[in-house]
C-alpha cells in the first residue's frame, strides 16, 4: 500500500521563500539527506541551477498540489528560467519517494528545438546523485 509521499528536502542558503510548510520534516540525523513527508500532494520537486556545465541544487521538497508531471516516476528536469546570463534553472516534478534526489540528465538549456550546450550527463543507466 502507498505511504504518504516522502521527498528529499533542501534549500540553498539565500533562496527566497521556503517550502518547509508543505510537509513534515523527518528526523534523519546529519549524514543522511533531509527528508520531508508531503502534506498536500504526492509529488516531489527539484530545482537545479546550471552554470557553465556545473549543476547546483537550489531547492528540493514537496509540491503544494498534484499537477502535470507529478505522475513521472523519475526526475526529468526541463529548463524554466534564466536567472542571470549564462545560468539556467531546471525543474522537475515526480511522484515516487525521494525521486527528487537525483536526475538522470539535464536537457540542453536552450528552448526546445534551439541548439544549446548539453548539461552534465550521466553515463547510460546511471544517475547523478546530488551531494546535499
Amino acid at each position: 500500500p502507498p505511504n504518504r509521499r516522502t521527498c528529499v528536502f533542501f534549500e540553498a542558503p539565500g533562496v527566497r521563500g521556503s517550502t518547509k510548510t508543505l510537509g513534515e520534516l523527518l528526523d534523519t540525523g546529519t549524514e543522511l539527506p533531509r527528508a520531508i513527508r508531503c502534506l498536500y500532494s504526492r509529488c516531489c520537486f527539484g530545482i537545479w541551477n546550471l552554470t557553465q556545465d556545473r549543476a547546483q541544487v537550489e531547492m528540493q521538497g514537496c509540491r503544494d498540489s498534484d499537477e502535470p508531471g507529478c505522475e513521472s516516476l523519475h526526475c526529468d528536469p526541463s529548463p524554466r528560467a534564466h536567472p542571470s546570463p549564462g545560468s539556467t534553472l531546471f525543474t522537475c516534478s515526480c511522484g515516487t519517494d525521494f525521486c527528487n534526489a537525483n536526475y538522470s540528465h539535464l536537457p540542453p538549456p536552450g528552448s526546445p528545438g534551439t541548439p544549446g550546450s548539453q548539461g552534465p550527463q550521466a553515463a547510460p543507466g546511471e544517475s547523478i546523485w546530488m551531494a546535499l
Partner: antibody, heavy 113, light 112 residues
Framework: QVQLVQSGAEVKVPGASVKMSCKAS????????VSWVRQSPGQGLEWIGE????????NFNEKFKGRVTLTVDKSTSTAYMELRSLRSDDTAVYYC??????WGQGVLVTVSS | DVVMTQSPLSLPVTLGQPASISCRSS???????????LEWYLQRPGQSPRLLIY???NRFSGVPDRFIGSGSGTDFTLKISRVEAEDVGVYYC?????????FGAGTKLEIK
C-alpha cells in the same frame, strides 16, 4: 515471488540488546519502505518504524525512538532491526514487512531473567 | 496517538452468510493529499498478518472480491459477502495517515 525471511527466535535477559534480520527477495529491495511491527502475546499489533533502503532514511514511533536502530545492507537485500535496553514487556513477535503488503514469518523475542 | 476502535471484538458467523466489521478512528484519516491511508489485515491462526484492503476500498492482489472495504473520514467498514472457512482469524484495521501509525485491537471471526 516476493518473500521476506526473518532470522530465528531469540531469548534475552532484561537490559540486553537484540538484532534481527529480514532478507528480502523477489522485488527491487531499494524501491519499497521496510516497516517493522510487533505483536505482544495475546495482544494486538504495534507499528515500530520504517526505513527506506535506497538512502537509509527512517521514521519511528516515538515510543521506540532512542531504543531502536533500523539499518539495511543493500548488497544482500537485508534489513535489520536492533532493539536495546530490553524489558520483559518487549517479549513479542517482531515482523518485517515490505511497505505493509508482504510480511515476514516473524521473530519471537523472549525477554526473561 | 490516533485510536482505532473496532467492533465487534468477536464475530461468530455461519458459513455462507455475510459479515461486517466496523472501525472508527479518533481523528479523520483523510490526509492533505486527498488519500485515506486506511488498511485491513487478516491474521489467520499461527500466521503472519496478510493485507486485504488498502486505501479504504482497494483489494490487494489475490484477495477475493467477497471482501469489500468502504467508509470515509473516521468511519470504516469491512464486509465479507459470504464467509468461507478460510476467512477465520483476527481482522485488524490500520491507519498510516498519522504518526505513529496505529492498529485496531482486532475482531476475531469464527464459524458458528
Amino acid at each position: 515471488q516476493v518473500q521476506l525471511v526473518q532470522s530465528g527466535a531469540e531469548v534475552k535477559v532484561p537490559g540486553a540488546s537484540v538484532k534481527m534480520s529480514c532478507k528480502a527477495s523477489g522485488y527491487t529491495f531499494t524501491d519499497y519502505w521496510v516497516s517493522w511491527v510487533r505483536q505482544s502475546p495475546g495482544q494486538g499489533l504495534e507499528w515500530i518504524g520504517e526505513i527506506y533502503p535506497k538512502n537509509g532514511v527512517s521514521n519511528f514511533n516515538e515510543k521506540f525512538k532512542g531504543r531502536v536502530t533500523l539499518t539495511v545492507d543493500k548488497s544482500t537485500s537485508t534489513a535489520y532491526m536492533e532493539l536495546r535496553s530490553l524489558r520483559s514487556d518487549d517479549t513479542a513477535v517482531y515482523y518485517c514487512t515490505r511497505q505493509r503488503d508482504y510480511w515476514g514469518q516473524g521473530v519471537l523475542v523472549t525477554v526473561s531473567s | 496517538d490516533v485510536v482505532m476502535t473496532q467492533s465487534p471484538l468477536s464475530l461468530p458467523v455461519t458459513l455462507g452468510q455475510p459479515a461486517s466489521i466496523s472501525c472508527r478512528s479518533s481523528q479523520s484519516l483523510e490526509y492533505g493529499d486527498g488519500y485515506t491511508y486506511l488498511e485491513w489485515y487478516l491474521q489467520r491462526p499461527g500466521q503472519s498478518p496478510r493485507l486485504l484492503i488498502y486505501g479504504v476500498s482497494n483489494r490487494f492482489s489475490g484477495v477475493p472480491d467477497r471482501f469489500i472495504g468502504s467508509g470515509s473520514g473516521t468511519d470504516f467498514t469491512l464486509k465479507i459477502s459470504r464467509v468461507e472457512a478460510e476467512d477465520v482469524g483476527v481482522y485488524y484495521c490500520f491507519q498510516a495517515t498519522h504518526d505513529p501509525n496505529t492498529f485496531g485491537a482486532g475482531t476475531k471471526l469464527e464459524i458458528k
